[in-house]
């Protein structure tokens, strides 16, 4: 049994880091493998992660952490029974993938303005809380070409757009994702999408 693709890990910078790797053949990850992880700290102890299958030869493990600070470093040991298959380390602050925003809501009762709001996925005491920026994706269910991205570079989790920038009388969907420049993170996953019917009064034509 050998590791074909070494574990790579990303952290949500809150409580979970996810590590993925590939074995050289079909593997029952949860029965055959264990990933031991330990914070490099005098009084820490090793924790065991039981991996799950992620495709035939792929494995994924969700490492639980109390919290994360920038100085944290973890040692990782991948075991198959008594055999050490791979040894490495992981610094969560250098491999951050933020949590996805939630509770995306489209408010259509503001006159001719669409107000999209969502929730910051972090609690106020987390470092990323004040460092997230967002991308909002809006697309038409009827027209695949009607697909747009709005970059929200301010901290407030909301976006206002004129309803008239979208076609009237058809249904749209929106979703949002986050990233943090301070840690050069990857983008989060997209939030669940939300749907609404876009309708607004056309202005009277002047003749």
């Amino acid at each position: 049994m050998k590791v074909l693709q070494e574990p790579t890990c990303v952290s949500d910078y809150m409580s979970i880091s996810t590590c993925e790797w590939k074995m050289n053949g079909p593997t029952n990850c949860s029965t055959e493998l264990r990933l031991l992880y330990q914070l490099v700290f005098l009084l820490s102890e090793a924790h065991t992660c039981i991996p799950e299958n992620n495709g035939g030869a792929g494995c994924v493990c969700h490492l639980l952490m109390d919290d994360v600070v920038s100085a944290d470093n973890y040692t990782l040991d991948l075991w198959a029974g008594q055999q050490l298959l791979w040894k490495g380390s992981f610094k969560p602050s250098e491999h951050v993938k933020p949590r996805a925003p939630g509770n995306l809501t489209v408010h259509t009762n503001v006159s001719d303005t669409l107000l999209l709001t969502w929730s910051n996925p972090y609690p106020p005491d987390n470092y990323l809380y004040n460092h997230l920026t967002y991308a909002v994706n809006i697309w038409s269910e009827n027209d695949p070409a009607d697909f747009r991205i709005y970059n929200v570079t301010y901290l407030e989790p909301s976006l206002r757009i004129a309803a008239s920038t979208l076609k009237s009388g058809i249904s749209y969907r929106a979703r949002v994702r986050a990233w943090a420049q301070c840690y050069n993170t990857t983008w989060s996953e997209w939030s669940p999408s939300t749907k609404w019917h876009n309708s607004y009064r056309e202005p009277f034509e002047q003749h």
Epitope: S44, E45, V69
Partner: antibody
Framework: EVQLLESGGGLVQPGGSLRLSCAAS????????MAWVRQAPGKGLEWVSA????????YYADSVKGRFTISRDNSKNTLYLQMNSLRAEDTAVYYC?????????WGQGTLVTVSS | QSVLTQPPSASGTPGQRVTISCSGS????????FNWYQQLPGTAPKLLIY???HRPSGVPDRFSGSKSGTSASLAISGLRSEDEADYYC???????????LGGGTKLTVLG
């Protein structure tokens, strides 16, 4: 709410023994390392000993090595410090502290006086 | 003799910004993070800053920490009379498998 309550302090003669206890509540005791820190009257803080969450690893300051023993009972949510061969210079308030990277919660302390 | 050196005293007037230093000896390993504790008169110490610059919840943002090599600093801005206390720095020394604490700095708020 995290609470740490030390007990077992008192007056003891040089060469004598005492056992300090620290009762923990408000958090999952078995998931945290713990430590003892002391403060002699009018002096600064001095780290004494620390123990990992399972008790697998234990560390002592040179000044108490071989005389003090730290232990824990996770089923009772209690930390202990057995102090033998006590000296006058061990006179101090002894604090129990929870460890999360640093000493993030402290008890109110128990006074140990070593005097003849 | 502590391997972390702090000035024995510091002072400032209300509203001022005060900085307390904590210096490791030249041979002190610089891999560990610094922590800061506040001890108000007659009370148990309280964690103020951990991992160089992180504040536990409930600690006002007037308190901030920084690290440079084997030294650290605690800054208190908008000084208040209730900040009058002893301040200690500390760090894990992995070469000695121990926790080392500075000698403490007594902060006096004047006026």
């Amino acid at each position: 709410e995290v609470q740490l309550l030390e007990s077992g302090g008192g007056l003891v003669q040089p060469g004598g023994s005492l056992r300090l206890s620290c009762a923990a509540s408000g958090f999952t005791f078995s998931r945290h390392a713990m430590a003892w820190v002391r403060q002699a009257p009018g002096k600064g803080l001095e780290w004494v000993s620390a123990i990992t969450m399972s008790g697998r690893s234990i560390y002592y300051a040179d000044s108490v090595k071989g005389r003090f023993t730290i232990s824990r009972d996770n089923s009772k949510n209690t930390l202990y410090l057995q102090m033998n061969s006590l000296r006058a210079e061990d006179t101090a308030v002894y604090y129990c502290a929870r460890v999360h990277r640093a000493f993030d919660y402290w008890g109110q302390g128990t006074l140990v006086t070593v005097s003849s | 003799q502590s391997v972390l050196t702090q000035p024995p005293s510091a002072s400032g007037t209300p509203g001022q910004r005060v900085t307390i230093s904590c210096s490791g000896s030249p041979l002190f390993p610089d891999s560990g993070s610094f922590n800061w504790y506040q001890q108000l008169p007659g009370t148990a110490p309280k964690l103020l800053i951990y991992a160089d610059s992180h504040r536990p919840s409930g600690v006002p943002d007037r308190f901030s920490g920084s690290k440079s090599g084997t030294s650290a600093s605690l800054a208190i801005s908008g000084l208040r009379s209730e900040d009058e206390a002893d301040y200690y720095c500390g760090t894990w020394d992995y070469s000695l498998n121990s926790y080392v604490l500075g000698g403490g700095t007594k902060l006096t708020v004047l006026g």
